[in-house]
């Protein structure tokens, strides 16, 4: 099959590739000596495992399903990775003061298997 | 219900000094940062600048740098736009707006508040 | 002069699909994101679409976003009187933060 499989997450609820959001502070990131603001980021990623077919992205990431199956000590099974991401604005520190700077690839916005 | 409260019209001469204000409610007021936004008589929206309000960090348009000045008053929830000597070019409504979450846009808006400038 | 391009006009009947347009350059939309506020009459601006294509919580999905390369469109379907208003779109620019475009007019004929 050509497209992109459902939903349906064989290995239960949840347990599947999918959008996690996990509360961090600048310490955690390791970003304090160089962001100010915000304070504290809701860190959006795709966590999960991708079972067979499950939200693959791609024709490759169906091929590599069936081969890990036929060889998975050779062929790893597919990541669960962002499909596509939220843009992010940071206050940062600069030389002369600080500065806002955009991020386009900073937060997940969905995910799919690849 | 997230809310933007601005203070009321004002009209002063020009060389005049003047403080708005705009309080914000509903929400955790240090968590989210404020913008300040322009519009002219009959003319479009123009970015003046940012501030954060707990930590009071400031960042101006290029086009406003200098001319005004943006604080913040953490205690009482509230965000400041103020002229040392106001121009009649100053004449316009002042919006203050609540960014979004990623900081990329304006969730919420006060009503406005419009600034005479005039002799 | 706008960082963002818009017509300053619009207008359609009610009940057809109407399209305003804003185009950047590879220094904003090319490279990031576009935000939709539309703003009635006597009013405040309000959040009408975020990120390209979506809508915040009660805007109806009568109104949608889109984008490719240097250019983005807010579409609107089924136009009723009260979508009269003026439509702005917002990025982000390298040199000066946040831009607005110049706005755009939409008349509701009839």
């Known amino acids: 099959a050509r497209a992109r499989n459902g939903d349906h997450c064989p290995l239960g609820p949840g347990r599947c590739c999918r959008l996690h959001t996990v509360r961090a502070s600048l310490e955690d990131l390791g970003w304090a000596d160089w962001v100010l603001s915000p304070r504290e980021v809701q860190v959006t990623m795709c966590i999960g495992a991708c079972p067979s077919q499950f939200r693959a992205a791609n024709m490759h990431a169906q091929i590599k399903t069936s081969l890990h199956r036929l060889k998975p000590d050779t062929v790893p099974a597919p990541c669960c990775v962002p499909a596509s991401y939220n843009p992010m604005v940071l206050i940062q520190k600069t030389r002369t003061g600080v500065s806002l700077q955009t991020y386009d690839d900073l937060l997940a916005k969905d995910c799919h298997c690849i | 219900e997230v809310q933007l409260v601005q203070s009321g019209a004002e009209v002063k001469k020009p060389g005049e000094s003047l403080k708005i204000s705009c309080k914000g409610s509903?929400?955790?007021?240090?968590?989210?940062?404020i913008g300040w936004v322009r519009q002219m008589p009959g003319k479009g929206l123009e970015w003046m600048g940012v501030?954060?309000?707990?930590?009071?960090?400031?960042i101006y348009s290029p086009s406003f740098q200098g001319q005004v000045t943006i604080s913040a008053d953490k205690s009482i929830s509230t965000a400041y736009l103020q002229w040392s000597s106001l121009k009649a070019s100053d004449t316009a409504m002042y919006y203050c707006?609540?960014?979004?979450?990623?900081?990329?846009?304006?969730?919420?808006w006060g009503q406005g508040t419009l600034v005479t400038v005039s002799s | 002069q706008s960082v963002l391009t818009q017509p300053p006009s619009v207008s359609g009947a009610p009940g057809q699909r109407v399209t305003i347009s804003c185009s950047g350059s590879?220094?904003?939309?090319?490279?990031?994101?576009v935000n939709w506020y539309q703003q009635l009459p006597g009013t405040a601006p309000k959040l009408l679409i975020y990120s390209n294509d979506n809508r915040p919580s009660g805007v109806p999905d009568r109104f949608s976003g889109s984008k490719s390369g240097t250019s983005a469109s807010l579409a609107i379907t089924g136009l009723q009187a009260e979508d009269e208003a003026d439509y702005y779109c917002q990025s982000w620019d390298s040199s000066s933060n946040y831009v607005f475009g110049g706005g755009t007019k939409l008349t509701v004929l009839g």
């Open positions: 707006a609540r960014y979004g979450r990623y900081g990329t846009y304006f969730d919420y």
């Open positions: 509903g929400y955790s007021f240090t968590s989210y940062w």
């Open positions: 501030i954060d309000p707990d930590g009071s960090y400031t």
């Open positions: 590879s220094s904003n939309i090319g490279v990031l994101y």
